[in-house]
């Protein structure tokens, strides 16, 4: 499978909410012994490999934000820790995987990465990730609502081993 990032750039005004999205493409094994681990984290530009560095999102680590579910299931973070930080990650039946960030501040600007791992009965088999940028703006130049910029098809379907 691949991970696509429908949008490579999100430009949002301070105080707004935003939902960053990744999408699983291609055949997804839904066998009973196959599960998926999905998470989000921050990273930085200028590395040899995008998303190799991992930073927390609002002090929450990739493990705090992770989802783990079967190939045929939907899931979302229900724990208080994420919600207290204005965060919620979710995954639906159609391969969409997202993180919602509420009440954005300038400190939320940066590079965000989603990670999806296919696990076949205890064994981590495939690891793929996607990257996107969030710019939070303030002042008269800021948009009134979030503006999203589509990825080029080449970028959005790029597979990168994490």
């Amino acid at each position: 499978f691949k991970v696509a990032t429908p949008y490579s750039l999100y430009v949002c005004p301070e105080g707004q909410n935003v939902t960053l999205t990744c999408r699983l493409l291609g055949p997804v094994d839904k066998g009973h012994d196959v599960t998926f681990y999905k998470t989000w984290y921050r990273s930085s530009r200028g590395e040899v490999q995008t998303c190799s560095e991992r930073r927390p999102i609002r002090n929450l680590t990739f493990q705090d934000l992770h989802l783990h579910h079967g190939g045929h299931q939907a899931a979302n973070t229900s724990h208080d820790l994420a919600q207290r930080h204005g965060l919620e990650s979710a995954s639906d039946h159609h391969g969409n995987f997202s993180i919602t960030m509420r009440n954005l501040t300038l400190l939320d600007s940066g590079l965000y990465c989603c990670l999806v791992v296919e696990i076949r009965h205890h064994h981590s088999e495939h690891r793929v990730h996607g990257a996107m940028e969030l710019q939070v703006q303030t002042g008269k130049d800021a948009p009134s609502n979030c503006v999203v910029y589509p990825s080029s098809s080449q970028d959005s379907e790029n597979i990168t081993a994490a």
């Epitope: 009973h32 599960t35 681990y37 998470t39 493990q63 791992v117 696990i119 205890h122 981590s124 690891r127």
Partner: antibody, heavy 121, light 106 residues
């Protein structure tokens, strides 16, 4: 906080059976495998098998088929391992361990405190 | 069955020394996990997927390897590191542990 609490030590007669319990708290018990591990002095750690509480699905180390039987009760978040036809070779500390998926890698992330089973006439 | 052979069985080191223990697999593996066990206690998850430290593990520990050969290294041993270290594979049933390396501090 995840915790696995095992039942207390057992002194058993040869030929008898024993049932060890492992109560889980702090996570979704039904969704993660419970592993069972044997440790005899000087013998290291030996994987016996596993159960997925939500479905009741089990996998056994061939060596322990017929010796160990796993069950789980999702209403009490408790997993059980029964050992039958006990011999002195079954004298050991038995651990339950909870599968944790960390960074997309499953491993034995949570361990019970161990249950000592002694088989003696 | 994949057999994991750990060496040495016993390792004696002085505080501040660098030590390395190895784990060899009878078949090639994608990665290896390591656990630490102290006498009278349950094993603790220590290093996952060959080289990643579990939460709370001191940075003096590191792991490396690929294929059939893996190792755990402590850059500067401390007294609290005295324990037995086990490697473990979760690639094929039966899932197996190595025989352990007991680290003694002089």
């Amino acid at each position: 906080q995840v915790q696995l609490q095992q039942s207390g030590a057992e002194l058993m007669k040869p030929g008898a059976s024993v049932k060890i319990s492992c109560k889980a708290t702090g996570y979704t018990f039904s969704r993660y495998w419970i592993e069972w591990v044997k440790q005899r002095p000087g013998h290291g750690l030996e994987w016996i098998g596993e159960i997925l509480p939500g479905s009741g699905s089990t996998n056994y180390n061939e060596k322990f088929k017929g010796k160990a039987t796993f069950t789980a009760d999702t209403s009490s978040n408790t997993a059980y391992m029964q050992l039958s036809s006990l011999t002195s070779e079954d004298s050991a500390v038995y651990y339950c361990a909870g599968e944790e998926v960390y960074d997309g890698y499953p491993w034995f992330g949570y361990w019970g405190q161990g249950t000592l089973v002694t088989v003696s006439a | 069955q994949i057999v994991l052979s750990q060496s040495p069985a016993i390792l004696s080191a002085s505080p501040g020394e660098k030590v390395t223990m190895t784990c060899r697999a009878s078949s090639s593996l994608s990665y290896m996990h390591w656990y630490q066990q102290k006498p009278g206690s349950s094993p603790k998850p220590w290093i996952y997927a060959t080289s990643n430290l579990a939460s709370g593990v001191p940075a003096r520990f590191s792991g490396s390897g690929s294929g059939t050969s893996y190792s755990l290294t402590i850059s500067r041993v401390e007294a609290e590191d005295a324990a037995t270290y086990y490697c473990q594979q979760w690639s094929s049933n039966p899932y197996t542990f190595g025989g352990g390396t007991k680290l003694e501090i002089k």
